[in-house]
Structure formats: C-alpha cells, structure tokens
C-alpha cells in the first residue's frame, strides 16, 4: 500500500506514494489526481492555444524532462520496472544543472535515498547508464559503501546530496525520468 | 536515426595487418562504448572488445591481447579496429557495434569482410 | 572465462509454433543477458537484453526469461521471417562471450 501524507504549510507533499515538489521555479505544479493518473504513460501534450503541461500528473518538470520521485520501497530492478511501467527509466544525470537540481528536491528528504539509473554487472566492469551510456566521473563521484561483508554494490543511489553504491537488492525510493522533445 | 556505417573488404597476406573502421551517426559519438565482434566463415560470433569512445579506455579479449588496437577520432566519429600478424584463421566478417541498455550491442555495423590469403 | 552453452545446436519449426531456446553459462551472471537474431548474410539484431527486456522495435512474441544461470528466449508463435540463428551473450564479466548459437530452420 502506498503512503498519503498531505500538507497544506510544508514543502513537499507525498500524494499515491510519489513526492511532489512545491517548488514554483520551471516546475510543474501538483494536482490531486487518482493514482490510476499518476502511472498513466503520457506523451508530450500539443497544444492547441492552450498551455498544457508535457508531463503527466504529480511528475516536476525540469528543462527537457519529467521527473517523478517515487516513495514505494524497491529493489533497483524493481524500480527500474516501475519507471518502465510509467513509460520512463531511472533518473540519468546529464549535466551538472540536472545534478543540482535532484539535489535540491532530495535534500528535503534527507532520511530517504533514492535510486537512479546506474549500475554494473560487478566491480570489474564499468557503471554503465540505464540507456547503455558510458559514465563519466567528471560529472560526479560514486562514494563507495563496499566492506569485506559486503563487497559487491553495483547499483547507484543519492542521499542528501552524496551519490553511493549499494547492493542492488536493498529496498528504496527511486526517481524515474521521462525526456520530452520540445 | 543511429547508423554505423564500416569500410569496405579487404584481401591481407599472413603476417600483415588490417584496420578497420566504423563511422557512427545519428546519436552522440562519445556516449557509447563500441564493440567489435568476429564471425569466421559458417561459424559463431565472437568477442574480441570494446573502446570508450569518450575516453579512448579499452577492454581486449585475453585471446587477442598483443596484437589488437582499438583507437577512435572523435571529431568524424569514427572507431577503428587494428590487428595485426594475421594468419589464415582470421579471415571473418569483422562488426563494430554501438552498446545498449546492459551492455548488449543494440546497433551493428554492416560488418568488413577480411580475407587473409597467401 | 564463462563459457555459454546453448541448446538445441538446431531446430525444425512451422509457422505458428511456440520454439524454446535455452542457454546456459558456466556461472552465474545475474541478468546480464543478451539474446540476437541473425540471418544468414546479415548483421545480428538484438532481440532482448537484460535476460528479459525487449529491444524496441522488437515484436512481442519474443520473449526472454530466467536468471542466473539459465535463460530461455521464447517465440510465442514463429513467423516466417523468424527462421534465423539465435544467439546468447552475457555481458557479466569480460570478455563477454557468446553462445555457439542455435539454428532455427522450416520443418
């Protein structure tokens, strides 16, 4: 079942188990939806002379893309279903604007940590972008949470605004990203 | 769209050497590893590495170690495969391949057929 | 190395068959999984990654399954343009090796 935590005075509110961010810059503003709207994949809406929002119900915009914060505990794999199943992927950090960004929203939540789109088959291998992207660590750095009994995390999370490894099976909050053309 | 578009056949002597390349298009370059993979004639489809286009990193097959190079000039976004001291047995359809989600190739080259004939 | 065994080497199937081909590596590699078609002359396609996700553009009758060790590309219905070979790759550990690749032919 999915959490429904609402308020009128604080920042962010959780409604069907998603966070929304009440920030009124570029974003987009929440409505009281059913969650049968909230997972409905939706394209980019046209515009007929009318201003409508290219992202589905309870997702922010920023720049070229919708971002859903979603508060259902899962597995990395399972959180990347869940993206899929709303038309989306695991959150991809694109630029240093994107990074700051997720920061600012996640930071409000800073007992949470939250799932993006980047993991290895094991540490030999290189991380890899859920597209198939290279990753580069000039954008940021993975701060490694590996130990002797635990010695293999190969997915990636964000806390606060430090980005970790962790064993892919742990469950936790995920962010998924759907691009739109303009 | 995404094109990977490679040179033309080639006819080596043993001992020789071969390099083959692999322009890409319709997606940034850099973002994406390159594989290479081989197909000897009637036979399977083999491995042989992949070059990070944005780094130039790679990653060669033990089997090919010494005597493979993989190298890319970003600015025609081109990838190229060297191998050199050919022998007979590496007469194959060579393809270069752009990678996709879980490190599968999601986009293959037309492939370059290399004879290796005395 | 991990070495990828695939089984049948070969098939004879009609059109409109559900065919079953299992792979099998030599440890385990998770999900990291590939299955490709490919016809004779031709580059192979990707069909599935992930052990079981489909490559856009890829019709739904193909499916891939399992984890692990053991994998199963399915073909709910075969279609003539279906009669190829099919290959398994894991990208788990360098070098990321194929399967010998088993042949799917008109009965």
């Known amino acids: 079942t999915m959490a429904i935590w609402r308020s009128n005075s604080g920042s962010n509110t959780l409604e069907n188990g998603y966070f929304l961010s009440r920030n009124k810059e570029n974003h987009s503003q929440p409505t009281q939806s059913s969650l049968e709207d909230s997972v409905t994949p939706t394209k980019a809406v046209k515009t007929t002379g009318v201003l409508s929002s290219p992202c589905p119900p309870n997702w922010i915009i920023y720049e070229k893309s919708c971002y859903l914060f979603s508060m259902s505990l899962n597995s990395w794999d399972g959180s990347k279903r869940q993206c899929w199943q709303l038309g989306s992927n695991l959150l991809k950090i694109d630029s240093s604007n994107e990074l700051g960004f997720i920061v600012k929203q996640v930071s409000s939540q800073p007992d949470n940590s939250f799932w993006i789109g980047l993991s290895r088959p094991q540490t030999e291998v290189p991380w890899l972008w859920e597209d198939g992207s290279t990753f580069s660590s000039n954008l940021f750095q993975i701060r490694t949470t590996a130990t002797q009994e635990n010695p293999s995390p190969n997915c990636v999370w964000i806390h606060v605004s430090v980005i970790y490894d962790q064993l892919c099976s742990v469950p936790s909050y995920s962010i998924c990203e759907k691009k739109f053309s303009m | 769209q995404v094109q990977l578009v490679q040179s033309g056949a080639e006819v080596k002597k043993p001992g020789a050497s071969v390099k083959v390349s692999c322009k890409s298009s319709g997606y940034t370059f850099t973002d994406y590893y390159i594989h290479w993979v081989r197909q000897a004639p009637g036979q399977g489809l083999e491995w042989m590495g992949w070059i990070n286009p944005n780094s130039g990193d790679t990653n060669y097959a033990q089997k090919f170690q010494g005597r493979i190079t993989m190298t890319r000039d970003t600015s025609i976004s081109t990838a190229y495969l060297e191998l050199s001291r050919l022998r007979s047995d590496d007469t194959a359809v060579f393809y270069c391949a752009r990678n996709s989600g879980s490190y599968s190739a999601g986009y293959w080259g037309q492939g370059t057929l290399v004879t290796v004939s005395s | 190395d991990i070495q990828m065994t695939q089984s049948p080497s070969s098939v004879s199937a009609s059109v409109g068959d559900r065919v079953t081909i299992t792979c099998r590596a030599s440890q385990g590699i998770s999900s990291w999984l590939a299955w490709y078609q490919q016809k004779p002359g031709k580059a192979p396609k990707l069909l599935i990654f992930?052990?079981?996700s489909l490559q856009s553009g890829v019709p739904s009758r193909f499916s891939g399954s399992g984890s692990g060790t053991d994998f199963t590309l399915t073909v709910s219905s075969l279609q003539p343009e279906d009669f190829a070979t099919y290959y398994c790759?894991?990208?788990?550990?360098?070098?990321?090796?194929f399967g010998p690749g088993t042949k799917v032919d008109i009965e």
């Open positions: 992930g052990a079981s």
């Open positions: 790759q894991q990208a788990y550990s360098f070098p990321f090796t």
